[in-house]
Every structure is written in C-alpha cells, then in structure tokens.
Interface confidence: low
Amino acid sequence: SPQNPGCPNAEDKNFPRTVMVNLNIRNRNTNSKRASDYYNRSSSPWNLHRNEDPERYPSVIWEAKCRHLGCVDADGNVDYHMNSVPIQQEILVLRREPRHCTNSFRLEKMLVSVGCTCVTPIVRHVA
Amino acid sequence: SPQNPGCPNAEDKNFPRTVMVNLNIRNRNTNSKRASDYYNRSSSPWNLHRNEDPERYPSVIWEAKCRHLGCVDADGNVDYHMNSVPIQQEILVLRREPRHCTNSFRLEKMLVSVGCTCVTPIVRHVA
C-alpha cells in the first residue's frame, strides 16, 4: 500500500522516536516449509547454537557456527586451501526497557551468523 | 540484566499485544567492520538485490540471489554436481498500520535470503 502523502518515513529524523507496536505477528507462518538440512550437506557445514534471552523479543535466536576452518571436498576431507566463513546479517530485535515490567521496548541491532559459505581466502595459510 | 520477577515473557500468551517501542536503535554500529565480499569469493556466489518499502522499518533490506545452479570449482568453472542454494532466515520487521499516519506498527515476519552455500544435491543431475 502506498504511503499516505505527508507521512514521514520511519527512518526520517523528524519521525517520532517512540511508536506503538502490535505484537500479533503478521505472516506468522511464512516459513512453513520444513527446516532445511543445508547445514549438514554444505561444503561449509555448520552447527546451530541456541541463543536465549528472556529480556529480548524474540527470546530464542539460532546462531550458526562453521564446523571447520576449511571446506569439505568431494571425498569428505577438509581442504584448507578454502575457508568456511559465517554469513552474517544484522537483525532487529526488541529489548525490554528495564522499567519495572512496563511494556516498553527499545529496538536493538544484533549481528547474527545465519549459515556458512565456502570462500577462496585472500591470504592462504602458511605452508 | 535478569528479568524482573513476575514480568511476563514477551512471548507469553498473557503478555500485552501492544507495546511501546523506542526507535533509537541500541548497538547501531554493531557491524562496524567493512562489508564482506564473500558474495563474490564464494564457491556459491550471489548477487544482492535491494528490497525497498517505505511502509516498513527497516525500509531497505538486501536480498541474496544465487548466481548459478551449480557451484564454482577451483578453476572457475560451474560444477553442476553440486548446487548453490540460498540460506534463508526469518527476520522481524515493523509494518506501518494503515491508519492515517498514526505512529502504529505491527510486527511482521519476513523470510529473507542472506547468502548462498554449496550443497551436495540429494538427487544428482543426470550425466
């Protein structure tokens, strides 16, 4: 839907700093497809770690950690001429403002690792 | 900081559905390091597409699209015995409620592709 004329963009300087947010999530079932097994089948496989914080919304976030420094070749061996690296993304979360249970939150940026990819290193390992 | 005793978790059923949110982002400069060039150096390289929506916060989100069906080998050729696949993540965004410029938003889930990884296909391509 087009923005109402005259409505400031939420990132404008003159936009109010405190807004009302409805927590009834729209598109709650966006990710209805089954969980992917890419983490196991990738040439840069990763493990998933549970990051839990009751003061945050969402309270549980899964973070990826690459299993190897190198990448797995066709024979299943780790090749150190390539590097497994985490693909990171900045996400927005809601952090409870510490004000005696008021329903106040502040937006917070988090840098999370979503998965891993295999890259050509710029500086190769010392032989 | 530990949660105040008696404060409902933001994901509890009895938590208020509408909360106040401060848009002054904490950790604004989390990702202070320079942007990664993994998208180019990966064996499953990707392009980044700008997804812009003024009704959303954040209004600009970058989405990854894998360049190839296969993966790039050490010689720079595309190997179709492996597959480039997108790593997807569900993120939360704020969607402006269409109420004549009120400062009301609703949480919305978005499924975004963050980058690509190279996986062993479950069914190999016919030779």
């Epitope: 780790v78 690296v85 | 390091k33």
Partner: nanobody, 117 residues
C-alpha cells in the same frame, strides 16, 4: 563495540616460553573461529594458528607445529597462544583475530614478541 585485546608479549631468550592472551568483548567467541597471526618487520602478516572451538578443528602453520598450542576459554571469552621453544625467527607483532577468513576480520592492536639473547 567489538574489541579484541592482546597481552602477554615481551622479550624472551631463545628456547624460552610465553603465553599470549586475547580478550574478546562485544561478541561471543563460541560462534567464531579465533586465531593468531604475526607480522615480522618487512614481512607480510601470516597465519600462525586458528581454533574452531565447536569441534576441535585446529590449524597450525608448519613453522610452529609442536611448539605452539592454541586454546579457547569460552567462559572468559578469551583465546590463548602458548609458545614454547621460541626461536629468533618467531620475533614479530602477534595479532589476535577472527580467522575463518583472512580478509573480513575483527583485529586486535597486536602485542610484540621479541626472541633474542
């Protein structure tokens, strides 16, 4: 703010030992491979050792194998490099960094190690 702070460098005689420490703040060591690099005067920075604490996958340069040991204490968010049987050619500034890649990293400011009699 992400920070990596090294300590433990100094002057040591050939055959001696040093233990370098790298304290990380602003992110969780457990999700990253962390390692040590070094740069000798007039030379390029080189990888010395990397540790991926999730599965014990560890890398050592051939020149330090059997002499150097890397370890990570996730509770203290600190990574260590135990250096034994030091040689003059180990003289360099030692840096701690996230080391899954040698390009896109958080780097510390470095600590000087000098091996000399």
């Amino acid at each position: 703010e992400v920070q990596l702070v090294e300590s433990g460098g100094g002057l040591v005689q050939p055959g001696g030992s040093l233990r370098l420490s790298c304290a990380a703040s602003g992110f969780t060591l457990g999700y990253y491979a962390i390692g040590w690099f070094r740069q000798a005067p007039g030379k390029e920075r080189e990888g010395v050792s990397c540790d991926s604490s999730s599965d014990g996958d560890t890398y050592y340069a051939n020149s330090v194998k059997g002499r150097f040991t890397i370890s990570t204490d996730n509770g203290k968010n600190t990574v260590y490099l135990q250096m034994n049987s030091l040689k003059p050619e180990d003289t360099a500034v030692y840096y701690c960094a996230t080391c899954t890649d040698w390009n896109y990293d958080y780097w510390g400011q470095g600590t000087q190690v000098t091996v000399s009699s």
